[in-house]
């Protein structure tokens, strides 16, 4: 009876999310393998988040709006492990917007989700950021490693969206 009611709840939650995400990929987790954590198909998952790489070339503001429509934000990178996971799926000759910007050009960088900007957990390429006119951040491959660079926000780039996993 308990399992039946849990399944019913799960199905109703799935139906609720179906209007936003036509397809979800779920895995069982938790100590009793009773919880399902899901990401929209074909998003990838890492720890408690889902990631989507958009190959559409758009400005930073349009890229953020695009993520927002999908219930996400441009990616906020919190750890080197997270960055290493993300970069496995990126093309080395491309650049991708991050959810990091400096709208006033005062070198006061801010994450789109209001996560405090911690200078000690940043992965800027050597010499970057280097221009107050370049107010948005990308991740790209340079000098044999992935890192961040400041660029013009209005210049179209690919982008990475991030959202919290859906738990049902």
């Amino acid at each position: 009876n308990f399992m039946y009611s849990k399944t019913v709840k799960r199905l109703s939650k799935l139906q609720e999310y179906q209007q936003y995400y036509p397809s979800l990929t779920c895995v069982m987790e938790g100590k009793d393998m009773e919880d399902w954590s899901c990401c929209p198909t074909p998003w990838t998952s890492f720890q408690s988040s889902c990631y989507f790489i958009s190959t559409v070339m758009q400005s930073w503001t349009k890229s953020q709006n695009n993520c927002s429509v999908m219930g996400a934000d441009l990616v906020v990178i919190n750890t080197k492990e997270e960055q290493d996971f993300i970069t496995q799926n990126l093309k080395i000759n491309s650049a991708y917007f991050l959810g990091l910007s400096d709208p006033k050009g005062w070198r006061h960088w801010q994450w789109v989700d209001q996560t405090p900007y911690n200078k000690n957990v940043t992965f800027w390429h050597s010499g970057e950021p280097n221009s107050p006119d370049e107010r948005c951040a990308i991740i790209n491959f340079r000098s044999e490693e992935w890192g961040w660079n400041d660029v013009h926000c209005h210049v179209p780039q690919k982008s990475i969206c991030k959202m919290k996993k859906i738990y049902i």
Partner: antibody, heavy 121, light 111 residues
Amino acid sequence: EVQLVESGGGLVKPGGSLRLSCAASGFTFSSYGMSWVRQAPGKGLEWVATISSGDSYTYYPDSVKGRFTISRDNAKNSLYLQMNSLRAEDTAVYYCARQLYYSYGYYFDYWGQGTTVTVSS
Amino acid sequence: DIVLTQSPASLAVSPGQRATITCRASESVSFHGTHLMHWYQQKPGQPPKLLIYAASNLESGVPARFSGSGSGTDFTLTINPVEAEDTANYYCQQSIEDPPTFGGGTKVEIK
């Protein structure tokens, strides 16, 4: 006082080339992005090319891509537009304009007086 | 590309009256309260001159009779009261995304 002075315009035959120059003074040229904007006779404004302050980024509309090249010499406080394979529809007054960044975009806060390019056989 | 449509194409206004020009963008040029639409004035035989930046900010040295408003896709330039020296073409321009684009212009004549 900010000044932008264009030169190099003239009459050229279709298929020909011209190099426009813009001499900047009264500000730290190397700190600003610059653009060329043109205006055909009796028509509106059309952006033609942009170059970033550090020369790392150039951008063109499809109408001139592959034919026009924007460049700058920060040591000489000068902006250039190399125009090749010119067409009749490139006939216009060409303005150089300074970009001032605001939030996620920019506007053109100073313009030169313009130089006239006429493409005709 | 973002297309900017200005209206009217021309208007004639008596001195002391109000002139209103609108600019409609094919998609939003605003983001989190910042509106990346700008206005320029161009008098015959002269280069364009910046009037208003970011929808409503008056450029230094521009008379206070010029004002701008709007957000998203719809923006307005108002001249109130109009003076004889305001005879000119007026252009809007967006910069939220490359390529930067201009409206087709509005010709303002003083009756």
